[in-house]
């Protein structure tokens, strides 16, 4: 029998400086593109090698982005969220939610589409 999988949820403010090729990550989610069941939030789906986010090291695939420069990302269409990041300026402040898997018992499987990445 599988052990129960619990999650430790933490929030962090991450300040990124836009690099020559931008912020360096991909997102999924939005009201028209639910990546996680019953959650229209915006999630990080890819960190680009040597990009600003990768060099900073704190943002991780699977993180939920709650706000950009203080602007809430709730109830946004996917493309509107993309545009918000693209127009966020040189210094970008992200409020993110990390969801760390805490294993109780045997190792579980984390599949694609799970917000923990």
């Amino acid at each position: 029998m599988n052990g129960r999988v619990d999650y430790l949820v933490t929030e962090e403010e991450i300040n990124l400086t836009r690099g020559p090729s931008g912020l360096g990550f991909n997102i999924v989610g939005g009201t028209d593109q639910q990546y996680v069941s019953n959650d229209s939030g915006i999630y990080v789906s890819r960190i680009k090698e040597n990009g600003a986010a990768a060099l900073d090291g704190r943002l991780q695939e699977g993180d939920k982005i709650l706000s950009v420069n203080g602007q809430d990302l709730k109830n946004l269409l996917h493309q509107d969220a993309v545009d918000l990041f693209r127009n966020a300026g040189y210094a970008v402040s992200l409020r993110v939610q990390h969801r760390l898997q805490v294993q109780n018992g045997p190792i579980g499987h984390r599949g694609e589409g799970d917000p923990s990445g």
């Epitope: 997102i27 890819r46 996917h78 993309v82 693209r86 589409g113």
Partner: nanobody, 126 residues
Framework: QVQLVESGGGLVQAGGSLRLSCTAS????????MAWFRQAPGKEREFVAA??????YYADSVKGRFTISRDNAKNTMYLQMNSLKPEDTAVYIC?????????????????????WGQGTQVTVSS
């Protein structure tokens, strides 16, 4: 890990048509940004077309002749190729990445994509 499998290639006469398919694994297919590239013998890999959440992109050499589309219910992307020319002869390869870049999107840049198929051969005879 996303697996991509292309099909639909073959031998066709100039002026003819083919429809290529790229079927992907994964249950979040609708979020993928996807593209077609091609590589002819002795040449660099060349961008053909891409499809994102918000639109489609084409190389100038195929505009008006090729159409990229997707069927999210079938986890499949398509490339409808009409008015084929001998210079369209190449191995056609599909590429994908999960999500949309928050940066300026460069559809022709291979670094935009994480996953690549093996390709399907298209030969156009004159």
């Amino acid at each position: 890990q996303v697996q991509l499998v292309e099909s639909g290639g073959g031998l066709v006469q100039a002026g003819g048509s083919l429809r290529l398919s790229c079927t992907a694994s994964g249950r979040t297919f609708s979020t993928y940004t996807m593209a077609w590239f091609r590589q002819a013998p002795g040449k660099e890999r060349e961008f053909v077309a891409a499809i994102t959440w918000s639109g489609t992109y084409y190389a100038d050499s195929v505009k008006g002749r090729f159409t990229i589309s997707r069927d999210n219910a079938k986890n499949t992307m398509y490339l409808q190729m009409n008015s084929l020319k001998p210079e369209d002869t190449a191995v056609y390869i599909c590429a994908a990445v999960i999500g949309s870049t928050v940066d300026s999107y460069s559809p022709s840049d291979p670094l935009e994509y994480d996953y690549w198929g093996q390709g399907t051969q298209v030969t156009v005879s004159s």
